[in-house]
Interface confidence: low
C-alpha cells in the first residue's frame, strides 16, 4: 500500500505528461489527481512509465471507480490493461467494438490471457450473441478463438456470422464443435451454387452427417484427402466404395497412403474386399469375399 503523503510544493500535476516519469511512486500517488488521470488516459500510453508507476496509476483509478471503470476510460487504458486482473474486468461493461479492438491490440502477438478471455466473455455476453463483426474482430486477433468455445457457447453464433469464419479458424476445433457449426454453415451457404458451396462448406465438414456426404458425392466435388481424414468416423462408415470414389474424384488414389489411419482404416474394415479391389489401389483389410455381411448400421443403432 502506497502511503498517503502530502504532495511536495510545486509538484502538483496539471496534466498527464512526460515529466511524471521522474516522479517517485509516492509522488505520483500524492500529486496526480485521479479525475485528471481518467480524463487524460489517452496520454498514458505515450509515456514510458515503469511497471511500478503503472501500478500506482491503476491504484488511483481503482479508488475513483470502485464499481468498475467507465467505457470512456477502458477504451484508452492501453498498456495499463495488462495490469488488470480478471476480477477487475468482470466489473466492466464494454459495449463498443472499438474498445474491444483497442484492448486486443495491446495483447496482440501473445496467447489469449485470462484477462483477454474475461474481456471477450463480458463483451459477448453483453451483446447477447457472437455477431459477425465481433467474430471478424476476434478471429483476426486469435485465429483459434472459435475452437476455444464450448459447443454450448457456439450455439449462440448466428448462421450469418459464419461468413466471417476462415478455414484456419477451425483448425483446432474438435468434432463436437463442428457438430454445432456445420448446420449453421449449411444454412449460411445454402443459396450458393455447387462448386462455390463446397469451397465454403469444406472446412465445416467434420460435423457433416452421412446423408450430406452422400449428397456431396453426387456433385463432383473432388474432396481432398486432408478434408476426408477430418470427417466423422461414424459418418464415413456407411459410405459405399462407389460413393467414396465419387466424393474424392481424382484424390481417391490418396486412400492408399492413409489406409491404416482413421477414419479410412475403419471404413476399409466395413467394405467387401472385392468392392475395394475395384479401386485398383491395393487396399487390404476388407471383408473377404463370400463372408456374410451383417447390417452394421443396424448393429450400431442397437449398441
Amino acid at each position: 500500500e502506497v502511503e498517503k503523503t502530502a504532495c511536495p510544493s510545486g509538484k502538483k500535476a496539471r496534466e498527464i505528461d512526460e515529466s511524471l516519469i521522474f516522479y517517485k511512486k509516492w509522488e505520483l500517488e500524492a500529486c496526480v489527481d485521479a479525475a485528471l488521470l481518467a480524463t487524460q488516459m489517452d496520454r498514458v500510453n505515450a509515456i514510458p512509465f515503469t511497471y511500478e508507476q503503472l501500478d500506482v496509476l491503476k491504484h488511483k483509478l481503482d479508488e475513483l471507480y470502485p464499481q468498475g471503470y467507465p467505457e470512456s476510460v477502458i477504451q484508452h487504458l492501453g498498456y495499463l490493461f495488462l495490469k488488470m486482473s480478471p476480477e477487475d474486468i468482470r466489473k466492466w461493461n464494454v459495449t463498443s467494438l472499438e474498445t474491444l479492438k483497442a484492448l486486443l491490440e495491446v495483447n496482440k502477438g501473445h496467447e489469449m490471457s485470462p484477462q483477454v478471455a474475461t474481456l471477450i466473455d463480458r463483451f459477448v455476453k453483453g451483446r447477447g450473441q457472437l455477431d459477425k463483426d465481433t467474430l471478424d474482430t476476434l478471429t483476426a486477433f486469435y485465429p483459434g478463438y472459435l475452437c476455444s468455445l464450448s459447443p454450448e457457447e457456439l450455439s449462440s453464433v448466428p448462421p450469418s456470422s459464419i461468413w466471417a469464419v476462415r478455414p484456419q479458424d477451425l483448425d483446432t476445433c474438435d468434432p463436437r464443435q463442428l457438430d454445432v457449426l456445420y448446420p449453421k454453415a449449411r444454412l449460411a451457404f445454402q443459396n450458393m451454387n455447387g462448386s462455390e458451396y463446397f469451397v465454403k462448406i469444406q472446412s465445416f465438414l467434420g460435423g457433416a452427417p452421412t446423408e450430406d456426404l452422400k449428397a456431396l458425392s453426387q456433385q463432383n466435388v473432388s474432396m481432398d484427402l486432408a478434408t476426408f481424414m477430418k470427417l466423422r468416423t461414424d459418418a464415413v462408415l456407411p459410405l459405399t466404395v462407389a460413393e467414396v470414389q465419387k466424393l474424392l474424384g481424382p484424390h481417391v488414389e490418396g486412400l492408399k497412403a492413409e489406409e491404416r489411419h482413421r477414419p479410412v482404416r475403419d471404413w476399409i474394415l466395413r467394405q467387401r474386399q472385392d468392392d475395394l479391389d475395384t479401386l485398383g489401389l491395393g487396399l487390404q483389410g476388407g471383408i473377404p469375399n463370400g463372408y456374410l455381411v451383417l447390417d452394421l448400421s443396424m448393429q450400431e443403432a442397437l449398441s
Partner: antibody, heavy 119, light 110 residues
C-alpha cells in the same frame, strides 16, 4: 492361434532409450485388417495406449509420446518394435504388445515385459 | 486426454449381478460406439470381454454384457462366480483418434 511375445524389458537408465520387440507367432503380421499395438500399464494399474503400426509401416501414436516414440515393423521376422527415447521414471511400466482389430478393441495380448527406469 | 473414470472397487456375492461404470465425455465414450471392456487377473495380461459397447468375442460367457447411456458405459456381470474376481478396465476411442483407458475397477467376489 496367434500369440504375441514381448522382449527387451528390464532396467533402463534415465535419459536413455527403451527398446522393445514383439514377436508374432501362429499367424502373419502381414494379414490385413489388424493393427499391431503397444500399451503400457503403470505401477498404479492405469493402462495407457501408446500407438499402433500396420504391416505397411503406417503408424498412429499417442500425441503425448509422439516426440519420443518410434514404432517400426519387420514383416520378414514377423515382429514389430518400440523405441522410446529420453526416458524418465514416469516411463516405468509393464509394456504389452497387442493386436487391435475392428472396433478399436485389443483381442490378443502378449504377457507383458516390465521396464524399470532407474539410475 | 484424461483417463476414463471407473469406481476403484465393487463387490458382490456369488450368483448376484454387479455393474461397473465407466464415465468419459462426449469426445470419447459419449461420441462413439467404440467402448471395450477387459478383464485382468493378477500377474496376467488383460483379456477382451466386450467390444463396440455390447458385443462379446467368441468364448466369452454370456453372463458378461455391456451397454452405454450418454457419456457413461457399463459392464454388467450376472450370476457372479469366484473366477470373475479380477480387475476390469474400460477403453474408448476418442475424437483425437486415440484410445483412452480407465484406471480399473477391482471386483471382489464375497
Amino acid at each position: 492361434q496367434v500369440q504375441l511375445q514381448e522382449s527387451g524389458g528390464g532396467l533402463v537408465k534415465p535419459s536413455e532409450t527403451l527398446s522393445l520387440t514383439c514377436t508374432v507367432s501362429g499367424g502373419s503380421i502381414s494379414s490385413g485388417g489388424y493393427f499391431w499395438s503397444w500399451i503400457r500399464q503403470h505401477p498404479g494399474k492405469c493402462l495407457e495406449w501408446i500407438g499402433y503400426i500396420y504391416y505397411s509401416g503406417s503408424t498412429y501414436t499417442n500425441p503425448s509420446l509422439r516426440d519420443r516414440l518410434k514404432i517400426s515393423v519387420d514383416t520378414s521376422k514377423n515382429q514389430f518394435s518400440l523405441k522410446l527415447s529420453s526416458v524418465t521414471a514416469a516411463d516405468t511400466a509393464m509394456y504389452y504388445c497387442a493386436r487391435e482389430g475392428a472396433g478399436y478393441a485389443f483381442d490378443i495380448w502378449g504377457q507383458g515385459t516390465m521396464v524399470t527406469v532407474s539410475s | 486426454q484424461s483417463a476414463l473414470t471407473q469406481p476403484a472397487s465393487v463387490s458382490g456375492s456369488p450368483g448376484q449381478s454387479i455393474t461397473i461404470s465407466c464415465t468419459g465425455t462426449s469426445s470419447d465414450v459419449g461420441g462413439y460406439n467404440y467402448v471395450s471392456w477387459y478383464q485382468q487377473h493378477p500377474g496376467k495380461a488383460p483379456k477382451l470381454m466386450i467390444y463396440e459397447v455390447s458385443n462379446r468375442p467368441s468364448g466369452v460367457s454370456n453372463r458378461f454384457s455391456g451397454s452405454k447411456s450418454g457419456n457413461t458405459a457399463s459392464l454388467t456381470i450376472s450370476g457372479l462366480q469366484a473366477e470373475d474376481e479380477a480387475d476390469y478396465y474400460c477403453s474408448s476411442y476418442t475424437s483425437s483418434s486415440t484410445l483412452v483407458f480407465g484406471c480399473g475397477t477391482k471386483l471382489t467376489v464375497l
